[in-house]
C-alpha cells in the first residue's frame, strides 16, 4: 500500500482543515488508514482523524481544531496499521478556504431597489471576520446568458442594485461566496442560492409635446 498523491490540506481558519490524498489502488480509507495530526506547540495533544473514501483510491479527512493563529503549524502522519506511509506538515494560514456565507436574503420591498443581505460566516473573534470580501452571482432561470457577478469589496455583507438592471417579470437566483486578500485565500464555496421574482414598475415615459407659440405682431 502506497500513497500515489500526497495529502493536500485547506483550512477554514476556524475549526476544520480538510486533507485529501490518493492511494495507489482501491482502499477502504476508514478501516485501513489513520491520519494523525498535532499542533506544534506546548501541551498540544496528538489527534487521530478517521478518513472517508473519496472515490475508489481517494481519501478525505476532516481535522478538527479548537482555534487557529497565523503561526500555527501541524505535523501530519499517515498510517496504515503500524506502517508510516507519509509524513508532512501543514500551515493553516497558508492554505485558507473561507467558510461559505449563509442566510442570503433578497429584500424586494424597497421600491425599485433590490437589497441582498447575507451573514458573515465567522464570529467576531476570528481574524477573517473583518477581512472578507464577497462576490454575488445573479442569474436568470429563463436565460442562461443573463449571468452577472457583482464584487463586494467593502466589509458590509450586503449589496444594493437597481431592480431595473434586471429584466422585469422573470425569476432570478442569487448566491454569494467569500475570500480574504490578507491570507491570499481561495474562494469559498457558493452559498445556497435564493430565488425571487423580479417585478418593478417601468418608469412612465413622458412624451414631450412641443407647443408652438404664435407670436402676434
Amino acid at each position: 500500500m502506497k500513497v500515489l498523491q500526497e495529502p493536500t490540506c485547506v483550512s477554514d481558519y476556524m475549526s476544520i482543515s480538510t486533507c485529501e490524498w490518493k492511494m495507489n489502488g482501491p482502499t477502504n480509507c476508514s478501516t485501513e488508514l489513520r491520519l494523525l495530526y498535532q499542533l506544534v506547540f506546548l501541551l498540544s495533544e496528538a489527534h487521530t482523524c478517521i478518513p472517508e473514501n473519496n472515490g475508489g483510491a481517494g481519501c478525505v479527512c476532516h481535522l478538527l481544531m479548537d482555534d487557529v493563529v497565523s503561526a500555527d503549524n501541524y505535523t501530519l502522519d499517515l498510517w496504515a496499521g503500524q506502517q508510516l506511509l507519509w509524513k508532512g506538515s501543514f500551515k493553516p494560514s497558508e492554505h485558507v478556504k473561507p467558510r461559505a456565507p449563509g442566510n442570503l436574503t433578497v429584500h424586494t420591498n424597497v421600491s425599485d431597489t433590490l437589497l441582498l443581505t447575507w451573514s458573515n460566516p465567522y464570529p467576531p473573534d476570528n481574524y477573517l471576520y473583518n477581512h472578507l470580501t464577497y462576490a454575488v452571482n445573479i442569474w436568470s432561470e429563463n436565460d442562461p446568458a443573463d449571468f452577472r457577478i457583482y464584487n463586494v469589496t467593502y466589509l458590509e455583507p450586503s449589496l444594493r442594485i437597481a431592480a431595473s438592471t434586471l429584466k422585469s417579470g422573470i425569476s432570478y437566483r442569487a448566491r454569494v461566496r467569500a475570500w480574504a486578500q490578507c491570507y491570499n485565500t481561495t474562494w469559498s464555496e457558493w452559498s445556497p442560492s435564493t430565488k425571487w421574482h423580479n417585478s418593478y414598475r417601468e418608469p412612465f415615459e413622458q412624451h414631450h409635446h412641443h407647443h408652438h407659440h404664435h407670436h402676434h405682431h
Epitope: S15, L42, L43, V69, A71, P123, D125, Y127, N130, C182
Partner: antibody
Framework: EVQLVQSGAEVKKPGATVKISCKVS????????MHWVKQAPGKGLEWMGR????????IYASKFQGKATITADTSSNTAYMELSSLRSEDTAVYHC?????????WGQGTLVTVSS | DIVMTQTPLSLSVTPGQPASISCRSS???????????LEWYLQKPGQSPQLLIY???NRFSGVPDRFSGSGSGTDFTLKISRVEAEDVGVYYC?????????FGQGTKLEIK
C-alpha cells in the same frame, strides 16, 4: 519552563496613563493569543481583551474599549496593555494570560493603584 | 453579553467530604465550531488563577482526579469528590465561546 513575567506595581494619579508589560519565555507569543484579565481588590475576574501577536488583531470587552489598548512586540516576545484616563475604579491587579485554547499560563499580576 | 452565574457563592466543607459548584450561562455557550469552551479556574490565596478543567469535562495536566466537570447547554458543574486542605480558594467558571468572554462571579471554598 514557561514564564509570564509582568512589570512591577504602579501608582498613578487620576487622568494619567499606564503601560504594563508581560515578558514571555518558554514559548513564542506568535503561537498564542495574549489576553488581559482585571481583578479589582476583593473582586472577581474580568476579561478585558486579547491580541493575536502575529497580525495585531485585537478584540475588547465593550467596557474596556477606549480604556485599554493591547499591543505586542514579537521580537521581544512581550505583550503590553496601556490604560488611559485612569480613575479610582481602575485600581486593580491586571493579569496577562496566554490562551491556546485555554488559559494555561498566567502572569503574576501587576497592581495598578490610582490615587490622588 | 453572556452572564455566568455561580452558586453557591461560598462553601464550607469538611476535609474528605464532596463539594459541588454550579455555573449557569445566560445563553448557550456552544461555539460556532461545535465546541463548548467552558472552563474552571481555581485562584488560591495570594496566587494567580490556575486551570482545572477545559471544554466542560477535560482535566488539565497535573490536576488531581478528584476534580471533575460536567454539564451541557447552559448548566455546568464542578465536583470535588473529596475536599483537601489545599483546595481552598476561589473557583471561577469561564466561557470562551462568545465574545466578550466572561467569568462567573466566583465561589469561595473554605475548610471547616
Amino acid at each position: 519552563e514557561v514564564q509570564l513575567v509582568q512589570s512591577g506595581a504602579e501608582v498613578k494619579k487620576p487622568g494619567a496613563t499606564v503601560k504594563i508589560s508581560c515578558k514571555v519565555s518558554g514559548f513564542n507569543i506568535k503561537d498564542t493569543y495574549m489576553h488581559w484579565v482585571k481583578q479589582a481588590p476583593g473582586k472577581g475576574l474580568e476579561w478585558m481583551g486579547r491580541i493575536d501577536p502575529t497580525n495585531g488583531y485585537t478584540i475588547y470587552a465593550s467596557k474596556f474599549q477606549g480604556k485599554a489598548t493591547i499591543t505586542a512586540d514579537t521580537s521581544s516576545n512581550t505583550a503590553y496593555m496601556e490604560l488611559s484616563s485612569l480613575r479610582s475604579e481602575d485600581t486593580a491587579v491586571y493579569h496577562c494570560v496566554s490562551r491556546r485554547p485555554w488559559f494555561a499560563y498566567w502572569g503574576q499580576g501587576t497592581l495598578v493603584t490610582v490615587s490622588s | 453579553d453572556i452572564v455566568m452565574t455561580q452558586t453557591p457563592l461560598s462553601l464550607s466543607v469538611t476535609p474528605g467530604q464532596p463539594a459541588s459548584i454550579s455555573c449557569r450561562s445566560s445563553q448557550s455557550i456552544v461555539h460556532s465550531n461545535g465546541n463548548t469552551y467552558l472552563e474552571w479556574y481555581l485562584q488560591k490565596p495570594g496566587q494567580s488563577p490556575q486551570l482545572l478543567i477545559y471544554k466542560v469535562t477535560n482535566r488539565f495536566s497535573g490536576v488531581p482526579d478528584r476534580f471533575s466537570g460536567s454539564g451541557s447547554g447552559t448548566d455546568f458543574t464542578l465536583k470535588i469528590s473529596r475536599v483537601e486542605a489545599e483546595d481552598v480558594g476561589v473557583y471561577y467558571c469561564f466561557q470562551g465561546s462568545h465574545v466578550p468572554y466572561t467569568f462567573g462571579q466566583g465561589t469561595k471554598l473554605e475548610i471547616k
